[in-house]
Interface confidence: medium
């Protein structure tokens, strides 16, 4: 619900937001030689232009197109890892398995990860006091529209076998309302993507249930199958051991670390 005074239900723009975005951009372009020619000042200008002086409940994907253009990046389309409600483990994984990429391993995802931002209609100010909450205020806010835009593009770019890490500790292992469930699943391209492989991450040490049989996973399988994409599922019973085995795959105790349950 738009308010006359810009007092929103969500936290305000992250402190030192402009400096953070610029610094992250410089750092990213230093670390990734293929992106070293991105002009970070232009990236920041495009980012700012997407939401400054605009009503924070009236942001569109179109607003972010200049930024999307500047941040265009080619990642290996068959090395994409999606995730839902288990970001930290997904990032730990790609830090070890350097040839796989989450959205936050791309420039635009890296820039915005864990940040909040919004502006005010007709002023050039950044609102550090409050920003719209997706549920309580509006869904077309700067942060939500950004992630919807970059997530859609990321999913559209995927090919061959796409992996997704899901949190087995949550009541809804697959949540239709998550970014993965509402955006990425529906933007995988059946003509390019052969299989979606879900990795269900177990939380409890003694948890030996087959979470690939969970009703929400069946729901995911149904959605994916209807889109002419094959589906497979694996239980990751011990995420700590899983990461160890990614680091040291030759370890003899690692052969049966991932338990397969294929569904076609």
């Amino acid at each position: 619900v738009p308010r006359w005074r810009q007092q929103w239900s969500g936290p305000g723009t992250t402190k030192r937001f402009p400096e953070t975005v610029l610094a992250r951009c410089v750092k990213y372009t230093e670390i990734h030689p293929e992106m070293r020619h991105v002009d970070c000042q232009s990236v920041w200008d495009a980012f700012k232009g997407a939401f400054i002086s605009k009503h924070p409940c009236n942001i569109t994907e179109e607003d972010y197109q200049p930024l999307m253009k500047l941040g265009t990046q080619t990642v290996p389309c068959n090395k994409i890892l999606l995730w839902s409600r288990i970001k930290d483990l997904a990032h730990q994984f790609t830090q070890v398995q350097r040839d796989m990429f989450t959205l936050e391993d791309t420039l635009l995802g890296y820039l915005a990860d864990d940040l909040t931002w919004c502006g005010e209609f007709n002023t050039s100010k950044i609102n550090y006091q409050s920003c719209p909450d997706w549920r309580k205020d509006c869904s077309n806010n700067p942060v939500s529209v950004f992630w919807k835009t970059v997530s859609r593009r990321f999913a559209e770019a995927a090919c061959d076998v796409v992996h997704v890490m899901l949190n087995g500790s949550r009541s809804k292992i697959f949540d239709k309302n998550s970014t993965f469930g509402s955006v990425e699943v529906h933007n995988l391209q059946p003509e390019k993507v052969q299989t979606l492989e879900a990795w269900v991450i177990h939380g409890g040490r003694e948890d030996s249930r087959d979470l690939c049989q969970d009703p929400t996973i069946k729901e995911l399988e149904s959605i994916i199958s209807k889109r002419n994409i094959q589906f497979s599922c694996k239980n990751i019973y011990r995420p700590d051991k899983f990461l160890q085995c990614v680091k040291n795959p030759e370890d003899s105790s690692c052969t049966s670390e991932i338990h397969h349950h294929h569904h076609h």
Partner: antibody, heavy 120, light 111 residues
Framework: EVQLVESGGGLVQPGGSLRLSCAAS????????MHWVRQAPGKGLEWVAF????????YYADTVKGRFTISRDNAKSSLFLQMTSLRAEDTAVYSC?????????????WGQGTTVTVSS | DIVMTQSPDSLAVSLGERATINCRAS??????????MHWYQQKPGQPPKLLIY???NLESGIPDRFSGSGSRTDFTLTISSLQAEDVATYYC?????????FGGGTKVEIK
């Protein structure tokens, strides 16, 4: 005020080693990539090496690769260039330079330089 | 490596007159719609000073009589009205590809 002060230059025999230092002040050193650039007597400028803010990316000119090592100590706001297997053609004034904040590969501040002479 | 060729090697211009320095790259230095070409001024006994970055952007604190233009392989530094303090050697530099490379320099003097 941004200041870059090089030290460690001198006369060294061919095949010898030298370690150059660059002391930085007037800015947050750990936020910037840094370069070494050299200028041979009466000649133009030649880029030598680059190190990113957190030392995660390092690049060298082919002419020095395998012989020179760039490093930094962010806690001490210092940049270093370890030079080994020195040759006569390495004779030059060596300057450290700060990478421009918003894009890799050009320099917004330079030090005065320290002279390295390789001769027998 | 990208070879940067500056012309002329030296230039004598009357005070208040226009000075033009050219720089040609052996291959395209444009990327992402941006020209990765930069210009520096070096006075005797001093380190170089950044004048122009990315072909046409004036570095802060640099007088606006300095300007840069060009794209792809051909670039120009112009001093619209030469002042005595502009006597120096001017270098172009590309950052589109490693190694970073400089032109040989153009010495500007008063006629």
């Amino acid at each position: 005020e941004v200041q870059l002060v090089e030290s460690g230059g001198g006369l060294v025999q061919p095949g010898g080693s030298l370690r150059l230092s660059c002391a930085a002040s007037g800015f947050t050193f750990s936020d910037y990539g840094m370069h070494w650039v050299r200028q041979a007597p009466g000649k133009g400028l030649e880029w030598v090496a680059f190190i990113s803010s957190g030392s995660s990316s390092i690049y060298y000119a082919d002419t020095v690769k395998g012989r020179f090592t760039i490093s930094r100590d962010n806690a001490k706001s210092s940049l270093f260039l370890q030079m080994t297997s020195l040759r006569a053609e390495d004779t030059a004034v060596y300057s450290c330079a700060r990478n421009y904040v918003s894009s890799y590969g050009y320099f917004d501040y330079w030090g005065q330089g320290t002279t390295v002479t390789v001769s027998s | 490596d990208i070879v940067m060729t500056q012309s002329p090697d030296s230039l004598a211009v009357s005070l208040g007159e226009r000075a033009t320095i050219n720089c040609r790259a052996s291959e395209n230095v444009d990327n992402y719609g941006i020209s990765f070409m930069h210009w520096y001024q070096q006075k005797p006994g001093q380190p170089p000073k950044l004048l122009i970055y990315r072909a046409s952007n004036l570095e802060s604190g640099i007088p606006d009589r300095f300007s840069g233009s060009g794209s792809r392989t051909d670039f120009t530094l112009t001093i619209s009205s030469l002042q005595a303090e502009d006597v120096a050697t001017y270098y172009c530099q590309q950052s589109n590809k490693d190694p970073l490379t400089f032109g040989g320099g153009t010495k500007v003097e008063i006629k």
